[in-house]
Interface confidence: medium
């Protein structure tokens, strides 16, 4: 490699630091906040990016009912604890001993506790729901042309196998985007459907995690596509547990 | 300094192949995806083709899927488009760019481009 080749980056985290230490000289990025070596061939793990977050300077209805166990992330950011893989560990505590059990996307799914609170495994999201809402426009969007496009999106942006996009709804002005992933279908290199729902997430709120990329142009059929609210459920495998029933949207 | 280097066009039979390389230097080559757009005689940018950076993927524009390949050799930092059996309406200047994935080309958001290649097909 040239030496013009030193000042190496990652093109899908931004909030990496690189340098060309790697095995045969070659280019080596590390989350910031972590320093874990990350693979930027592919998206990198949603705690790693939000331990790199915390880690920054602060600055007739066609329609999904989400079910009564659907989690929706109240409790916004924090500094995640994560395992030498990249994965959330099951429990979080922050700094005043305070503790509770995330699921795989590092959303709670208990009540809160103290360090005697234990989280016996790391429970997969299996089922995720985006739920947008689009801003005013001329007329409604086709539906197939809509469902091709955003699946075509987290095909190629986001590198998630087609299989994963269990369905998009679409009734004027939501949208649903389903992502469905067992355990027994997520094969070694496939990208985590937790981790294409955050880089989504960014990129509609105009936080794109790639490097040198302007915001996400999202159109169908050359219209702009807008969103102007997000919302996201959390399905786990196995339910959540939290002492009173809670409200869901 | 960033750059690539686009070769390999010229004139063409109807029906006839060429092959375009692009040469890569000044970045990570083999951690970016590439693709190649051309720009035909007073017209727009047409995206033409998209790689993954370690090739396992790629993408066509229809006007091209069965006739043009893409292809890239990370040791050589080098992209290529195998272009064949093509026809008048492919003549244009065809560029490099660099771009994490095929939807880029929505987005118009390429870091780096080529100075580009012309490709004239005529009898």
């Known amino acids: 490699h040239t030496a013009a080749q030193d000042n190496c980056t990652c093109p899908t985290n931004k909030m990496t630091v690189c340098s060309p230490d790697g095995p045969g000289g070659r280019c080596q990025c590390r989350a910031l906040g972590s320093g874990m070596a990350v693979d930027c061939s592919t998206l990198t793990s949603k705690c790693l990016l939000l331990k790199a977050r915390m880690s920054a300077p602060k600055n007739a209805r066609t329609l999904v009912r989400p079910s009564e166990h659907a989690l929706v992330d109240n409790d916004g950011l924090y500094d995640p604890d994560c395992d030498p893989e990249g994965r959330f560990k099951a429990r979080q505590c922050n700094q005043t001993s305070v503790c509770w059990c995330v699921n795989s996307v590092g959303v709670r799914r208990t009540d809160k506790g103290d360090l005697s609170l234990r989280c016996d495994e790391l429970v997969r999201t299996h089922h995720i729901l985006i739920d947008l809402r689009h801003r005013p426009t001329a007329g409604a969007f086709n539906h197939s042309d809509l469902d091709a496009e955003l699946r075509r999106l987290f095909r190629e942006r986001y590198r998630l196998h087609p299989k994963f996009v269990a369905a998009v709804h679409y009734e004027q002005p939501t949208i649903q985007i389903e992502l469905r992933q067992n355990t027994s279908q997520k094969a070694a290199g496939d990208v985590d459907i937790g981790d294409a729902a955050y880089y989504f997430e960014r990129d509609i709120k105009g936080e794109s995690l790639f490097q040198g990329r302007g915001g996400l142009d999202l159109r169908v059929r050359g219209e702009p596509l807008q969103v102007e609210r997000t919302l996201i459920y959390y399905l786990d495998e196995i339910p959540p547990k939290f002492s009173m029933k809670r409200l869901t949207a | 300094e960033v750059q690539v280097v686009e070769s390999g066009g010229g004139l063409a039979q109807p029906g006839g192949s060429l092959r375009l390389s692009c040469a890569a230097s000044?970045?990570?080559?083999?951690?970016?995806?590439m693709s190649w757009a051309r720009q035909a005689p007073g017209k727009g940018l047409e995206w033409v083709s998209g790689i993954y950076a370690d090739g396992s993927a790629t993408y066509y524009a229809d006007s091209v899927k069965g006739r043009f390949t893409i292809s890239r050799d990370n040791a050589k930092n080098t992209l290529y488009l195998h272009m064949n059996s093509l026809k008048p309406e492919d003549t244009a200047l065809y560029y490099c760019?660099?771009?994490?994935?095929?939807?880029?080309?929505?987005?118009?958001?390429?870091?780096?481009w080529g100075q580009g290649t012309q490709v004239t097909v005529s009898s």
């Open positions: 000044g970045f990570w080559f083999s951690t970016y995806a």
């Open positions: 760019a660099q771009g994490y994935s095929d939807y880029d080309r929505r987005v118009g958001g390429y870091d780096y």
